[in-house]
Interface confidence: low
């Protein structure tokens, strides 16, 4: 007869290990006992259980209520045994000796390995600001056994390095992701994916990215000068820029305060009926926690009477 | 006990192809993750790629992406590396490697003795 067995029994942290070992005897042969004992390479054998034809299951203190039998129907030639709840402990070289007659006595070693997903994690770098150079935008740990991969899943531009620190029985492994800051980043997912023989399925975890920035600021509504006459209603100046943080706006007269009347929404300076007193240098200023910016424009209220004689001077010149 | 044993290399012309092989034994080949990795003369050794336990999942370096391509055989036991548009630089022994836990013991890195790629007209 011989033995089957499995050279290596793999695992997840948590589960049953079935420790197979089963005997192909010849006609009438009989086991009569199975002894289960670990062997790792340095120490000496250490019993885990006895499997008698005739007394039945025996279980070393060590391993009481964690080694048992495989549920019934049984063969009397199957001598493997159930070790519940793996623990990385547990790894190790496992020995069965089944002891039968007539043909004697037979051994066979299997490898147990205990797979231990890891529980990745990931930490934001420090805040990201358009015009950094190459930055840590987050970095991503996963421990477990074997060593996990960990990889970076973006549409963002950037580099990766890893580096990986072994235990005695794990190991840690840290990638991180560094980038060039820039506006067009904003709101762009980073995922950490983690892999590895224990997980069903790549484990993500997803940071979005801030890059502060304050773009150039610009001030509409003086495309056409000559809608700003006197008399004129709802003239208003729009202070346009982004920015991350959202920005904050500020108008200002340069030549003096407000004219009376002039209303500030936020980033809109809206205009009573128009008079010459409006005219003047408005500077609208934009900040946020990151930068600041001004834009100025100069307002020419145009007085329509004075205009149409100057047209009529021109016709009469020529 | 892990073994592993590199074929393949051999002196070939820039542009040309070579295919590594590694047949390992002694640990668990359809589970672990394996690499390749390389060593110029008077450099370090660097990681050239690297593939799951599955085969499922790849990694290359900058340097070779686009041009080598690493697969597993686990019916075989055997690591392999096609190495395409070689390029002088790609001159160096090229390494098999795997990380195996056993037991309690600290012994992750297995390598192989290595086969040498040299990439000259």
């Known amino acids: 007869g011989e033995l089957e067995t499995s050279d290596v029994v793999t695992v997840v942290l948590g589960q049953d290990a079935k420790l197979p070992c089963f005997y192909r005897g010849d006609s009438g042969e009989q086991v009569g006992q199975v002894a289960w004992a670990r062997v790792d390479a340095g120490e000496g054998a250490q019993e885990l259980a006895l499997l008698h034809s005739k007394y039945g299951l025996h279980v070393s203190p060590a391993y009481e209520g964690r080694v048992e039998q495989p549920p019934p129907p049984r063969n009397p030639l199957d001598g493997s045994v159930l070790l519940r709840n793996a623990v990385q402990a547990d790894e190790g070289e496992y020995e069965c000796r089944v002891s039968t007659f007539p043909a004697g006595s037979f051994q066979a070693r299997l490898r147990l390995r205990v797979l231990v997903p890891p529980l990745p994690s990931l930490n934001p770098g420090p805040a990201l600001e358009e015009g950094q150079g190459l930055t840590l935008a987050a970095s991503c740990t996963a421990e477990g056994s074997p060593a996990p991969s960990v990889t970076w899943d973006t549409e963002v531009k950037g580099t990766t390095s890893s580096r990986s620190f072994k235990h005695s029985r794990s190991a840690a492994v840290t990638s991180e992701f560094h980038l060039v800051p820039s506006r067009s980043m904003n709101g762009q997912p980073l995922t950490c994916v983690v892999s590895h023989p224990g997980l069903l399925q790549d484990q993500r975890i997803t940071h979005i990215l801030h890059v502060s920035f304050l773009a150039e600021a610009s001030v509409r509504g003086l495309e056409d000068q000559n809608l700003w006459h006197i008399g004129r209603e709802g003239a208003m100046l729009k202070c346009l820029s982004e920015g991350q943080p959202p920005p904050s706006y500020n108008w200002t007269r340069l030549d003096g305060p407000l004219p009376s009347g002039v209303r500030v929404d936020g980033d809109t300076l809206g205009f009573p009926p128009l008079t010459t007193e409006h005219s003047g240098i408005y500077v609208c200023h934009v900040s946020n926690e990151f930068s600041s910016r001004d834009s100025q424009v100069t307002v020419d209220v145009l007085d329509p009477q004075e205009d149409s004689g100057k047209q009529v001077d021109l016709v009469s010149a020529s | 006990e892990v073994q592993l044993l590199e074929s393949g290399g051999g002196l070939v012309q820039p542009g040309g192809s070579l295919r590594l092989s590694c047949a390992a034994s002694g640990f668990a080949f359809s589970i672990d993750a394996m690499g390749w990795y390389r060593q110029a003369p008077g450099k370090e050794r660097e990681g050239v790629s690297s593939?799951?336990?599955?085969?499922?999942?790849?990694r290359y370096a900058d340097s070779v992406k686009g041009r080598f391509t690493i697969s597993r055989d686990n019916s075989k036991n055997t690591l392999y590396l096609q190495m395409n548009s070689l390029k002088p630089e790609d001159t160096a022994v090229y390494y098999c490697?795997?990380?195996?836990?056993?037991?309690?013991?600290?012994?992750?890195?297995?390598w192989g003795q290595g086969t040498q790629v040299t990439v000259s007209s």
């Open positions: 490697d795997t990380a195996v836990l056993t037991g309690y013991s600290e012994a992750f890195d297995y």
């Open positions: 593939i799951s336990g599955s085969g499922g999942l790849t």
